[in-house]
């Protein structure tokens, strides 16, 4: 019995659902009563899901798997794995037994995009040309391990004096911290690129240092120029710092975070005490770092509704403020492709191909092309609908007249994460049915 699975690994984003495709060719007169189907982990032989005696025997894998019962009779033995975790990565074997027996293994490659890097300087005040400064580039919650590259403002690679460490959290996601030590010139731009090798996703940030003494007078409040990009459901740090003078004590500090536009209070520190969160109890300061001038705000479990500008007000004897933008993002799922009509297709038929990708933010850009990379822009209709959480489901419909054969591919791009998700469908033969019977 020939069992078919994809040659390439199935790539799935952490938290999304993945389909491990497996198919066989049922003979005429085949009934599900004859079918024994077992999915198991290739290495440990742990049972994942099974179908026997005409019945779905259910998930033996954390209750996160499902078959496609309506498609089994057509030879579709694919397995749906829900809420993918890093620990799911590996090889799954699909065993099919009717009268004969066959098996094949499919690899699952798990991935998670890295956050836009945050950049910190140490020391971060009174910098002069000739000073040695440590620049730290931190990017969070990615998988697998990242590759990190540094360069200056002219694209010159900076490879000396770089130390990169990557630590996995309980979920197996990596936080990467890369440290560059440089001697300052008159001024300079330093940029850090964090690459996810599986998603081929680049996240980058840069810092420009102009060494000079801060002007006396108002408190100089520093925030990142670029928006802070945070994935929905993760935590974000809105960085804000000031330069405390010698003899500064927290009793002198008044710190207020508020929404820039509505002036709604978010969090405050006054009279030597953290006054707590006024923002859905999802914010926190870094109390141990306040005395060193770190007034950053931690925003937990980021939602789409959090997107916008936050102002950091610092008052000691003098007063200063600066606004930092929060850009919320969520990766789009791998598009699913459907055809209408989906059977007895012949050259000359008009067919509607729908490309659907789910739960991304902000709105996606959608591109269609044929198998030669030629863009298909005519007869495309794209709609994007936000759910209650503000995440978008995108549905793009392409109407084409079939040739003898053709590949149609759809690319869904998240413009903030610079993340591309794509799906394609190949229509061959005459006549044919979709999905093709294996």
């Amino acid at each position: 019995l020939e069992v078919q699975v994809p040659e390439d690994p199935v790539v799935a984003l952490v938290g999304t659902d993945a389909t491990l495709c497996c198919s066989f060719s049922p003979e005429p007169g085949f009934s599900l009563a004859q079918l024994n189907l077992i999915w198991q982990l290739t290495d440990t032989k742990q049972l994942v899901h099974s179908f026997a005696e005409g019945q779905d025997q259910g998930s033996a894998y954390a209750n996160r798997t499902a078959l496609f019962p309506d498609l089994l009779a057509q030879g579709n033995a694919s397995l749906r794995l829900q809420r993918v975790r890093v620990a799911d990565e590996g090889s799954f074997t699909c065993f099919v037994s009717i009268r004969d027996f066959g098996s094949a293994a499919v690899s699952l490659q798990v991935a998670a995009p890295y956050s836009k890097p945050s950049m910190t300087l140490e020391p971060n005040k009174d910098l002069r040309p000739g000073d040695t400064v440590t620049i730290t580039c931190s990017s969070y919650q990615g998988y697998p391990e990242a590759e990190v590259f540094w360069q200056d403002g002219q694209g010159v690679p900076l490879t000396g004096n770089v130390t990169t460490s990557q630590m996995a959290n309980e979920q197996g996601l990596f936080d990467v911290h890369s440290i560059l030590r440089v001697v300052l010139g008159a001024n300079g731009t330093y940029s850090c690129l964090v690459r996810n090798p599986v998603l081929q996703q680049d996240a980058h940030s840069s810092v420009t240092i102009t060494p000079q003494r801060s002007p006396t007078g108002a408190v100089e409040v520093q925030v990142p120029e670029d928006p802070v990009v945070a994935l929905v459901g993760t935590d974000a740090t809105l960085r804000c710092s000031f330069s405390p003078e010698p003899g500064f004590s927290l009793a002198q500090l008044n710190l207020i975070w508020q929404l820039t536009d509505t002036k709604q209070l978010v969090h405050s520190f006054t009279e030597g005490r953290d006054q707590g969160s006024a923002y859905a109890n999802r914010t926190a300061l870094f109390p141990d770092l306040l005395a060193q001038g770190n007034a950053s705000l931690r925003l937990q479990r980021v939602r789409v509704a959090d997107e916008g500008s936050f102002t950091c007000f610092v008052s000691i004897r003098d007063f200063g403020s600066a606004a930092v933008s929060l850009q919320v993002a969520a990766p789009y799922s791998k598009p699913s492709m459907t055809l209408e009509p989906n059977k007895d297709l012949r050259p000359g038929d008009t067919v509607t191909i729908t490309c659907s990708s789910y739960r991304g933010y902000p709105e996606a850009e959608v591109f269609w092309q044929d198998g030669q990379g030629v863009p298909l822009t005519g007869n495309v209709t794209t709609s994007q609908m936000a759910n209650e959480q503000g995440l978008f489901d995108v549905h793009s419909v392409l109407r084409v007249v079939l040739g003898a054969n053709g590949t149609y591919s759809c690319l869904v791009r998240n413009p903030v994460l610079q993340q591309d998700a794509h799906g394609s469908v190949t229509i061959t033969g005459q006549p044919m049915t979709f999905p093709p019977e294996a």
Epitope: Q151, Q154, G155, P157, T159, L193, R195, D202
Partner: antibody
């Protein structure tokens, strides 16, 4: 129009030096690094080094480090590459090129027309 | 030094054919650029940052890849594409080019 115009062909004796110029026009000369790349007859491209015309920082391919000097004159928007102790294997076309782009992606978007240097006794 | 190895070194192809040139780096690079050089001409930028078409370059050219393996693809080759193609990286010193792939049109 952004252009890099190089000096004319040179014929040199082994052991001597050659200095090739590259005049930039149509853009801010100090905003981009200028690189020198050479190509021996029938061979591929070989990077020699670069200069940041603003800071005058330079870096060279170790292979040429002791023999090459790259300089720039901001007042005339001209970069120079001098190669000393010439030998026959230095016979090549020498190109200057502008390294352009923005963080973090950079590339050679403008090339000079090339200067042929022939080393022969 | 990061060594870039292109394959093939030489290819003779007929018009309308699809051509794939690969560039393998000896260690991981952040991105790859591709250049086209015709006889007695200066190199010309073709693909920047792995997959972005340079200005004025026909859409039959495309680039892809990541890490150590990169590809330049020419869909439906035309006679004017006869040239030598070079990949280039500068993720670490020195800046390096591939040895080149010469395309000849039959």
């Amino acid at each position: 129009e952004v252009q890099l115009v190089q000096s004319g062909a040179e014929v040199k004796k082994p052991g001597s030096s050659v200095k090739v110029s590259c005049k930039a026009s149509g853009y801010s000369f100090t905003s981009y690094t200028i690189h020198w790349v050479r190509q021996a007859p029938g061979q591929g491209l070989e990077w020699m080094g670069y200069i940041n015309p603003n800071s005058r920082n330079t870096d060279y391919n170790q292979k040429f480090k002791d023999r090459v000097t790259i300089t720039a004159d901001k007042s005339t928007s001209t970069a120079y590459m001098e190669l000393s102790s010439l030998r026959s294997e230095d016979t090549a076309v020498y190109y200057c090129a502008r390294y352009s782009g923005s963080t973090p992606y950079w590339y050679f978007d403008v090339w000079g027309q090339g200067t042929t240097v022939t080393v022969s006794s | 030094e990061i060594v870039l190895t292109q394959s093939p070194d030489f290819q003779s192809v007929t018009p309308k054919e699809k051509v794939t040139i690969t560039c393998r780096a000896s260690s991981s690079v952040s991105y790859m650029n591709w250049y086209q050089q015709k006889p007695d001409q200066s190199p010309k930028l073709l693909i920047k940052a792995t997959s972005n078409l340079a200005s004025g370059v026909p859409s039959r050219f495309s680039g892809s890849g990541s890490g150590t393996d990169f590809t330049l693809t020419i869909n439906s080759l035309e006679a004017e594409d006869a040239a030598t193609y070079y990949c280039q990286q500068w993720s670490s010193n020195p800046l390096t080019f591939g040895q080149g792939t010469k395309l000849e049109i039959k």
